[in-house]
């Protein structure tokens, strides 16, 4: 809207500013338990997971960043049960990685899962 | 507490994992107006900056990934009033990036904020 | 200042294609959603879809799905709306609009007539 | 799809004087965001439609302070303070919190 005001340069600047903000997939780490909905005495080791989720900001306000493809990734975790019965058992988790990602109205009732396996 | 019982290359990778999970600055993308406060008759354009907020995880459930440290950014955007009764202005809009992070046991206060000049 | 201008009036017959444009001025194209409007004759206002022209992502309307496709070609900030299969009640004014980050459609073009007529 | 409901259909209204408009929609038009996407549109004869008011009750570029709209959750209001003769056309709500966008059946503002 402004572009016969202000100089290329700082236009430019302020474009690429908007379009790095733009919704897609971005690395973020999730709790694990608490996306597998596990009881409080189980837990994992690391409790924490990197994965890509959608994220970002999108043409319209009424709009949100969501999910449009997903991949699942496994990763190695120790699970712990409290009282330790046992020695912790390395088990495989599979996590909601987001590959797609689109601008759209409403939210999912269930806009990502992570399978146990 | 396992390194007797796996091999120390699945050890090392979940050691990774959880470095790469620990609280930090991380890239995020924060939607100016609503954290400006502003009225709906007043926006920006881009709506959202990059900026570094804290984020992650802590090894305690009870601690929470916080700001230690912020210095704060200026970013150049347009601020349009509706009705437009002038040319959209081009303002530097200071915008706090978080420089430290660390576990702490409660929420701030005030645990970032934009600065308007 | 923001500017929409759109193609010009078309004739076509029932069964065929048509591809109207709308090259936009003035602002940041990628930057805001485009949508696309139709008015039959004496009629209201009916919604077809949008693109965002940043990705080229499409929401289309459940009624036109599988009719029509919305595209943009970044390099000249210009969208077009495809719709096939045209029936005579696909006669009307097309519409593109610019919508606002706050959802209002804040400018327009002023249309491209689509005649569908054997 | 949300059923946006105007009255009256027709308005004949003298120069100077009130008008209103009311839109009625089949469901609430607040966003999980908290804001309701409800806009109100100007259609003047032989014209493109124009935008006169987003999200309720914000007036947009240009548009003379004799425009307001009011309303909340599925009832809204478009009232003009003084009508002018530059007033005459078709006015139509539409709303965007809901896919698709639909729009009002549209009222008629003509001059007495």
């Known amino acids: 809207f402004a572009a016969t005001f202000y100089d290329i340069e700082t236009l430019k600047v302020i474009d690429e500013e908007w379009q790095r903000t733009q919704c897609s997939p971005r690395e973020t780490c999730v709790e694990v338990a608490s996306e597998l909905g596990k009881s409080t005495n189980t837990f994992f080791k690391p409790p924490c997971v990197n994965v890509f989720r959608c994220g970002g900001c999108c043409n319209e306000e009424s709009l949100i960043c969501m999910n449009t493809s997903t991949s699942y990734i496994s990763k190695q975790l120790f699970e712990i049960s409290v009282p330790l019965t046992s020695v912790p058992e390395l088990v495989p988790v599979k996590v909601a990685n987001h590959t797609g990602c689109k601008c759209l109205p409403t939210a999912p009732r269930h806009p990502y899962s992570i399978i146990r396996r | 507490f396992a390194a007797t019982f796996y091999d120390i290359e699945t050890l090392k990778v979940i050691d990774e994992e959880w470095q790469r999970t620990q609280c930090s600055p991380r890239e995020t993308c924060v939607e100016v107006a609503s954290e400006l406060g502003k009225s709906t008759n007043t926006f920006f354009k881009p709506p959202c900056v990059n900026v570094f907020r804290c984020g992650g995880c802590c090894n305690e459930e009870s601690l929470i990934c916080m700001n230690t440290s912020t210095s704060y950014i200026s970013k150049q955007l347009f601020e349009i009033s509706v009705p437009l009764t002038s040319v959209p202005e081009l303002v530097p809009v200071k915008v706090a990036n978080h420089t430290g992070c660390k576990c702490l046991p409660t929420a701030p206060r005030h645990p970032y904020s934009i600065i308007r000049r | 200042q923001v500017q929409l201008v759109q193609s010009g009036a078309k004739v076509k017959q029932p069964g065929a294609s048509v591809k109207a444009s709308c090259k936009a001025s003035g602002y940041t194209f990628t930057g805001y959603n485009m949508y696309w409007v139709r008015q039959a004759p004496g009629q209201g206002l009916e919604w077809v879809g949008y693109i965002d022209p940043y990705n080229g992502d499409t929401t289309y309307n459940q009624k036109f799905k599988g009719r029509v496709t919305m595209t943009t070609d970044t390099s000249t900030s210009t969208a077009y709306m495809e719709l096939r299969s045209l029936r005579s009640d696909d006669t009307a004014v097309y519409y593109c609009a610019r919508t606002s980050y706050y959802g209002g459609m804040d400018y327009w073009g002023r249309g491209t007539l689509v005649t569908v007529a054997s | 799809d949300i059923v946006m409901t105007q009255t009256p259909l027709s308005s004949p209204v003298t120069l100077g004087q009130p008008a209103s408009i009311s839109c009625r929609s089949s469901?609430?038009?607040?966003?999980?965001?908290?804001?309701?996407?409800l806009h109100w549109l100007q259609q003047r004869p032989g014209q493109p439609p124009r935008l006169l008011i987003y999200?309720?009750?914000n007036r947009f570029s240009g548009v003379p302070d004799r425009f307001s709209g009011s309303g909340a959750g599925t009832d809204f209001t478009l009232k003009i303070s003084r009508v002018e003769a530059e007033d005459v056309g078709v006015y139509y709500c539409?709303?965007?919190?809901?896919?698709?966008?639909?729009f009002g059946q549209g009222t008629k503002l003509e001059i007495k």
């Open positions: 999200k309720v009750s």
């Open positions: 469901q609430s038009l607040v966003h999980s965001n908290g804001n309701t996407y």
């Open positions: 539409s709303q965007s919190t809901h896919v698709p966008r639909t």
